[in-house]
C-alpha cells in the first residue's frame, strides 16, 4: 500500500523558520500535492501550497517556498512572523493525489523535543547515512586488519612461528542503515526511479535525500477515489494526463499554442495564479 510520510523541521539558525518535508512511497503517478495546516485537506485545514508535477506550484502565506525535492517528495519552507510561534504545535498535512486512482494523506507536527519554548535552541543531530556508515565501517576493518598484520609480522621477526592462519572479519557486520522505513523506500533512496513512476519539474529536481531525515513514514489515510487500480493495470503516464488532446481548455474560437512537449496552455496563460476561490463547498 502506498504511504505518505511527513516531517516538520525547525531551522536551528532561525527559530521562526520551519520546513515541512513530505514524500510518497509507492507506485503510481502523482498528479497533485496539497499541503495544509491545522488539519487535513477537506477537514478544516488551511491550504499552504499546491504543487503540480508539470505546471508549477502555488502557495499562500505564511508559505515561503514550495518545491519538488525528488519525483515523489516535496518541501515547503514557512516563515513564522508571530513571536508566539504558532507552528510549534501545529499539525501539517500532505495529500498526494493520483487522479483518478486515489489520494493519500498523512499529517505530522514538530517533535516536542524541538519546541522553540525550550531554554536552549535545538541542535541538529547528525544522522549517519547508510553509505557513510558502510565506508567508515570498512575503513575501520581495513585499518584494524593492517595494524594486526603489522603486529604479527613484528612478532614473527622476533620469534619464528609456524604458518600464519589469517582471521576472517565480516565487514558487513559493521555496516549500518540510517533510515529504513520499508523496502520500497530503500530502493528509492539509492535509485529514485526504482519504484515510483512519477513526473517532476526538471528544474528543481534533486534526487539526493538530505542528511538528517530520520522520521519514519506515518501510515497514510487512503481515500479511494474512482476505480481501484489492480496490480495488472498499467498506471497512467503523466503525458496522457496533461496532453495535447486536452487542449487544456481554450476559450471559444481560440486555438492553443504549443508550449512544450505534451502541454498546451492558453494564449493568455500567465502561469499559476493565487485565486481565493468561491468553490468552498460546504
Amino acid at each position: 500500500t502506498p504511504e505518505v510520510w511527513v516531517q516538520v523541521q525547525m531551522e536551528a539558525t532561525e527559530l521562526s523558520s520551519f520546513t515541512v518535508h513530505c514524500g510518497f512511497l509507492g507506485p503510481g503517478s502523482i498528479s497533485l500535492v496539497t499541503v495544509s495546516w491545522g488539519g487535513p485537506d477537506g477537514a478544516g485545514g488551511t491550504k499552504l501550497a499546491v504543487l503540480h508535477p508539470e505546471l508549477g506550484t502555488r502557495q499562500w502565506a505564511p508559505a515561503r517556498q514550495a518545491r519538488w525535492e525528488t519525483q515523489s517528495s516535496i518541501s515547503l519552507a514557512l516563515e513564522d512572523s508571530g513571536a508566539s510561534s504558532p507552528f510549534a504545535n501545529t499539525t501539517f498535512c500532505c495529500k498526494f493525489a493520483s487522479f483518478p486512482e486515489g489520494s493519500w494523506e498523512s499529517c505530522g507536527s514538530l517533535p516536542p523535543s524541538s519546541d522553540p519554548g525550550l531554554s536552549a535552541p535545538p541542535t541538529p543531530v547528525p544522522i549517519l547515512r547508510a553509505d557513510l556508515a558502510g565506508i567508515l565501517g570498512l575503513s575501520g576493518v581495513l585499518l584494524f586488519g593492517c595494524g594486526y598484520l603489522l603486529h604479527l609480522l613484528r612478532r614473527q621477526k622476533h620469534r619464528p612461528t609456524p604458518r600464519l592462519q589469517p582471521s576472517h572479519t565480516n565487514s558487513q557486520a559493521l555496516t549500518a542503515q540510517a533510515w529504513a522505513p520499508s523496502q520500497a523506500s530503500q530502493a528509492a533512496l539509492h535509485d529514485p526511479y526504482a519504484t515510483i513512476n512519477t513526473s517532476f519539474c526538471p528544474a528543481t529536481l534533486d534526487t539526493a535525500h538530505p542528511n538528517g531525515w530520520a522520521s519514519l513514514p506515518t501510515h497514510a489515510a487512503h481515500q479511494p477515489q474512482g476505480p481501484a487500480a489492480s496490480a495488472s493495470t498499467p498506471i497512467l503516464a503523466r503525458g496522457s494526463f496533461v496532453s495535447v488532446e486536452n487542449g487544456l481548455y481554450t476559450q471559444a474560437g481560440e486555438r492553443p499554442p504549443h508550449t512544450g512537449p505534451g502541454l498546451t496552455l492558453f494564449p493568455d496563460c500567465r502561469g499559476p495564479r493565487a485565486v481565493e476561490g468561491r468553490f468552498g463547498v460546504r
Epitope: D41, G42, K47, V242, R270, P272, R278, G280
Partner: nanobody
Framework: EVQLVESGGGLVQPGGSLRLSCAAS????????MGWFRQAPGKGLEGVAH???????RYVESVKGRFTISQDHAKNSLYLQMNSLRAEDTAVYYC??????????????WGQGTMVTVSS
C-alpha cells in the same frame, strides 16, 4: 472530507443528449475551479470543461458548441449538458474540484465517475 457524486450517465444514441450532475458535499478550502474530466476506454485523461471561481466556463476544443457546463451554488451542484453526442464521447466522466494553474484545472478531489456510452 469532500464528497463528489456523479449521476446521469448511461447509453445514448449518436446525436442524442445527456445531462450529467455532480452533487458536492463536505468542505474544500481555497479551491478555485470545478469541472469535468473524462477517460475513454484505453485512453488517457482529458479535461472536458471547468468553471473558474470567476464563473467563466472553459471547454476543450472537441466539445465546444455541444457541451455546456453550469453550476447551482445553492444546491452545491455542477452540471454538464451534453448535446449532439458522438461515439468518441464514450468515456467515464469524473466531476472534479481543483486548483488553477494558468488556465488548467488540476483535480484535487473527484467522484467515482459515471459512464457515458454513445452507440447505435
Amino acid at each position: 472530507e469532500v464528497q463528489l457524486v456523479e449521476s446521469g450517465g448511461g447509453l445514448v444514441q449518436p446525436g442524442g443528449s445527456l445531462r450529467l450532475s455532480c452533487a458536492a458535499s463536505g468542505y474544500t478550502s481555497r479551491t478555485d475551479c470545478m469541472g469535468w474530466f473524462r477517460q475513454a476506454p484505453g485512453k488517457g485523461l482529458e479535461g472536458v470543461a471547468h468553471i473558474d471561481s470567476d464563473g467563466i466556463p472553459r471547454y476543450v476544443e472537441s466539445v465546444k458548441g455541444r457541451f455546456t457546463i453550469s453550476q447551482d451554488h445553492a444546491k452545491n451542484s455542477l452540471y454538464l449538458q451534453m448535446n449532439s453526442l458522438r461515439a468518441e464521447d464514450t468515456a467515464v466522466y469524473y466531476c472534479v474540484v481543483g486548483f488553477k494553474f494558468g488556465d488548467y484545472c488540476a483535480p484535487n478531489d473527484w467522484g467515482q465517475g459515471t459512464m457515458v456510452t454513445v452507440s447505435s
